[in-house]
Amino acid sequence: RKIPKVGHTFFQKPESCPPVPGGSMKLDIGIINENQRVSMSRNIESRSTSPWNYTVTWDPNRYPSEVVQAQCRNLGCINAQGKEDISMNSVPIQQETLVVRRKHQGCSVSFQLEKVLVTVGCTCVTPVIHHVQ
Amino acid sequence: RKIPKVGHTFFQKPESCPPVPGGSMKLDIGIINENQRVSMSRNIESRSTSPWNYTVTWDPNRYPSEVVQAQCRNLGCINAQGKEDISMNSVPIQQETLVVRRKHQGCSVSFQLEKVLVTVGCTCVTPVIHHVQ
């Protein structure tokens, strides 16, 4: 799903207040709901009729440093006989998410939000038919 | 997928530098890759064999203010005849994502990262059989 453009109004102070100095804001340390955890059914990536693999990307100057991307294993979907059914399609499910980018020059450290497109998994769909002229 | 605990080391300055004052950091305004967009196949939530509905939650003090959650429509999956096949299961695909929480008291505005669990869509799986003693 889409993250709307900031328009930078979210990060601005109320109009009656002095503006934010130097185009930066105060970000408190710590993460709210940090202990919240995904509780998905186990191994759904291999049990799915539209199975997928995971690739991990790592960047020490990004939080979270590890971002996991899914890739659908097949064009078709797996039928009850364990064979690929090409009349159906495995398609990626994508999500826009935020990460924090760390930028430092010597002892001056600043952070900036970054939008990342994550493929979370795959689902099996009936393909849309387009008649080509 | 899981976001690891911060351990707050990511947000700390190098050891040789003076510590961050007042437990906060500098967050630059603006979002990197803000124009990046999801390019999923259209209406996959209704074309999927494990279809889902969307619910939108809205919070003006969160960025993004709009967070969309998916809910699987069925316990089973939809077969080629358009009927629910209860021998297979529709299961949610979840993703941990970051949002920014805005906190203000008068003209003092600060921000904090918050972890949110998002159900992005559903996939059709073979259920795991557990033999109960």
Epitope: C72, L75, E84, I86, N89, S90, V91, P92, V125, P127, V128, I129, H130, V132 | S41, R42, I44, R47
Partner: nanobody
Framework: QVQLVESGGGLVRTGGSLRLSCSVS????????MGWYRQVPGRQRELVAM????????YYADSVKGRFTISRINANNTIYLQMNNLKPEDTAIYYC?????????MGQGTLVTVSS
Amino acid sequence: QVQLVESGGGLVRTGGSLRLSCSVSGDISSQSAMGWYRQVPGRQRELVAMIHTTKGDTYYADSVKGRFTISRINANNTIYLQMNNLKPEDTAIYYCTHNEPGDLYMGQGTLVTVSS
């Protein structure tokens, strides 16, 4: 935008052979396939044969296995359907298709008639 150009349909006697060809141009992803569906008016469209564009895996309907062969020339994204030992029940409009995940592009079709 995907373009499909089909050729090779016609009239043939039972037991005869025909070769259909189709070339695809436009945006083609690595996870895609090309192939043929067929349809008899008033009946449901049937997948005949498909070939994966990168893996080269092939898929055939049970009714054509051992008689039809799908092949592909990578360089110009052209596929061929060699149809041998044709039967009257193979009479249909054959549609070239290009399948991107979630989207199936279908050509205008070429008529194959098998007379007994």
